[in-house]
């Protein structure tokens, strides 16, 4: 698994560098997760032809993966720091069940999948410290998540491979949008 942010050789070699700000730490955490996603996607794409599949739109419609929309206040037009932050945290919390699903989906990158999951939990904690309005953040219902996980794991092999591909791709897109929005805060 990759070294967690703040512990890479670059940081060790540059002790004179100013400590990271809260925003920079969050930025670095997201990049670390994105690197992990890239490694997982490499294995997924090498193992199956899902990355080129034209049937992904059909499968995507059956998954309720978090997405950024204009109303979420994360885009330049209508940017709203608090609304956007709530959306990012809520979205990450919703992704957690899908990251749990990924845990048994990798052979050579099992550690990497765990690192992505744990790093996302850390990112959520960072962001919750930043949020002023924690009451607006809705936590997914554990019972609903458990039944969703069971349903996903009961799919046939082709659908499981497709689901894995779509989760990784959607999570990457969500993090990219989040990263851009968070820089403006």
């Amino acid at each position: 698994a990759p070294v967690p942010p703040g512990e890479d050789s670059k940081d060790v070699a540059a002790p004179h560098r100013q400590p990271l700000t809260s925003s920079e730490r969050i930025d670095k955490q997201i990049r670390y997760i994105l690197d992990g996603i890239s490694a997982l996607r490499k294995e997924t794409c090498n193992k199956s032809n899902m990355c080129e599949s034209s049937k992904e739109a059909l499968a995507e419609n059956n998954l309720n993966l978090p997405k950024m929309a204009e109303k979420d206040g994360c885009f330049q037009s209508g940017f709203n720091e608090e609304t956007c932050l709530v959306k990012i945290i809520t979205g990450l919390l919703e992704f957690e069940v899908y990251l749990e699903y990924l845990q048994n989906r990798f052979e050579s990158s099992e550690e990497q999948a765990r690192a992505v999951q744990m790093s996302t939990k850390v990112l959520i904690q960072f962001l919750q410290k930043k949020a002023k309005n924690l009451d607006a953040i809705t936590t997914p219902d554990p019972t609903t998540n458990a039944s969703l996980l069971t349903k996903l794991q009961a799919q046939n092999q082709w659908l499981q491979d497709m689901t894995t591909h779509l989760i990784l791709r959607s999570f990457k897109e969500f993090l990219q949008s989040s990263l851009r929005a968070l820089r403006q805060m």
Epitope: E24, M68, E70, F75, R169, Q176, L179, R180, R183, Q184
Partner: antibody
């Protein structure tokens, strides 16, 4: 090797609409943000706006009322339209790719001249 | 909008010289700054991102530093192919903005 190829009309009259298209070859369209940037002759760079595959856009407020950036995911292309052009819009227009940081890949540029 | 101001606007230097270009942001941008090189009639080329990370394939004589509002691009030993115009650009917020450019000419 990812390449951006751009094309469009090079000579326009005042009040016409500038229209340029940029095609992405050899890389993923979905995972990046795609921008238009312009450079008037002998001057610096000005960011016009960007689009994501989903169609979400961000525009430079100074041009927003005249700019439309759209996407055609089936063709791996995105386009720029700039309405009511004047001589001040004469520039080299570039398309470029942005992931998390810089504009790492650029099109070859298209010189657009506005003259009556 | 965040204003980016480069200095100097132009400079003359010889092959082998150490060259430093500075860029100042009108407000703090953390380390969300990129540097580009542009040669006549060509598209800009990315050199550095995140203030100090070298883009792949860029020679190690190029380096970047800074955080907050003040940034520097250094060319440790100027080569003939380095004579060009250099731009800084912030990507903390929208709209993305560039410095006005620094032209590096042969002395």
């Amino acid at each position: 090797q990812v390449q951006l190829q751009q094309w469009g009309a090079g000579l326009l009259k005042p009040s016409e609409t500038l229209s340029l298209t940029c095609a992405i070859y050899g890389g993923s369209f979905r995972e990046y943000y795609w921008s238009w940037i312009r450079q008037p002759p002998g001057k610096g760079l000005e960011w016009i706006g960007e689009i994501f595959h989903s169609g979400s856009t961000n525009y430079n407020p100074s041009l927003k009322s005249r700019v439309t950036i759209s996407v055609d995911t089936s063709k791996n292309q995105f386009s720029l339209k700039l309405s009511s052009v004047t001589a001040a819009d004469t520039a080299v227009y570039y398309c470029a790719r942005e992931e998390l940081d810089d504009f790492d890949i650029w099109g070859q540029g298209t010189m657009v001249t506005v003259s009556s | 909008d965040i204003q980016m101001t480069q200095s100097p606007s132009s400079l003359s230097a010889s092959v082998g010289d150490r060259v430093t270009i500075t860029c100042r942001a009108s407000q703090g941008i953390s380390s969300w700054l990129a540097w580009y090189q542009q040669k006549p009639e060509k598209a800009p080329k990315s050199l550095i991102y995140a203030a100090s990370s070298l883009q792949s394939g860029v020679p190690s004589r190029f380096s970047g530093s800074g955080s907050g509002t003040d940034f520097t691009l250094t060319i440790s030993s100027l080569q003939p192919e380095d004579f060009a115009t250099y731009y800084c650009q912030q990507y903390k917020s929208y709209p993305r903005t560039f410095g006005q450019g620094t032209k590096v000419e042969i002395k």
